[in-house]
């Protein structure tokens, strides 16, 4: 016996209390695909949570997250708050990043400044809670000996602001 | 169907108290973690208070001594005691479930209530 249920287009499940009827997907559900023997219920975003598309017969609400706070994840299942730049969220809330980190986003954990010293150049702007070093020419070339076509920029001793 | 309904709020001069409650069904109550967040037109949301399970309690640093998450599992309810209340406090509050355990995140599958609204104001 054929099923009947296959030429069920999206937007309508197969009613199998009706002869396998195709009937069309009840308010605040959805079908992305034909032969659907049920609907699934649409996202709702609540809270957090606020509306990017709308549901509809064919497919699924998307989120996005409302103002102070950034999506994870796939599709935005979860929400987080943001915190500022220089800050990191933890189990306690927004925290200044440590001496010697960074953030330079809202979003994401504070990161070690880049160790300047590891590729053999020195530090040329020092890092802050916002903002990674910037490392300049190594040492080596900022001797007075070494042959240079245009004269560097005068270098600061490698340190570290206070924060 | 997964029903959370607050009260307690209204208006409250400044350092003056209020207990917030949530009653919650339609889910094992016992085994999951809730939270506090309010909305205001200044701030926007702010994530305040949650209590795991177990009862551990988490607060945000501007509520910290002052505010008290509670719940109480044989009667479905998780309170937010407000104590020392201040003009900023002023807020629409909302209980929500906190399957993330996270600080300031919530999930899609997160349930909210409708919110009570809480006015500190001489």
């Known amino acids: 016996l054929q099923d009947l249920c296959s030429n069920c287009p999206a937007g309508t499940f197969c009613d199998n209390n009706r002869s396998q009827i195709c009937s069309p997907c009840p308010p605040n559900s959805f079908s992305s695909a034909g032969g659907q023997r049920t609907c699934d219920i649409c996202r709702q975003c609540k809270g957090v949570f606020k509306t990017r598309k709308e549901c509809s017969s064919t497919s699924n609400a998307e989120c996005d997250c409302i103002s102070g706070y950034h999506c994870l994840g796939a599709e935005c299942s979860m929400c987080e708050q943001d915190c500022k730049q220089g800050q990191e969220l933890t189990k306690k809330g927004c925290k200044d990043c440590c001496f010697g980190t960074f953030n330079d986003q809202k979003r994401g954990i504070c990161r070690p400044w880049t160790n300047c010293s590891l590729d053999g150049k020195s530090v040329l702007v020092n890092g802050t809670k916002e903002r990674d070093v910037v490392c300049g020419p190594s040492p080596a070339d900022l001797s007075p000996g070494a042959s240079s076509a245009t004269p560097p920029a005068p270098a600061r001793e490698p340190g570290h602001s206070p924060q | 169907e997964v029903q959370l309904v607050e009260s307690g709020g209204g208006l409250v001069q400044p350092g003056g108290s209020l207990r917030l409650s949530c009653a919650a069904s339609?889910?094992?109550?016992?085994?999951?973690?809730m939270s506090w967040a309010r909305q205001t037109p200044g701030k926007g949301f702010e994530w305040v208070s949650g209590i795991y399970s177990d009862g551990s309690t988490y607060y945000t640093d501007s509520v910290k001594d002052r505010f008290t998450i509670s719940r109480d599992n044989a009667k479905n309810t998780v309170y937010l005691q407000m104590n020392s209340l201040k003009p900023e406090d002023t807020a629409v509050y909302y209980c929500?479930?906190?399957?993330?355990?996270?600080?300031?995140?919530?999930?899609?599958?997160?349930?909210w209530g409708q919110g009570t609204q809480v006015t500190v104001s001489s």
């Open positions: 339609g889910f094992t109550f016992s085994s999951s973690a």
């Open positions: 929500a479930t906190w399957g993330t355990l996270r600080f300031g995140v919530w999930a899609e599958y997160d349930h």
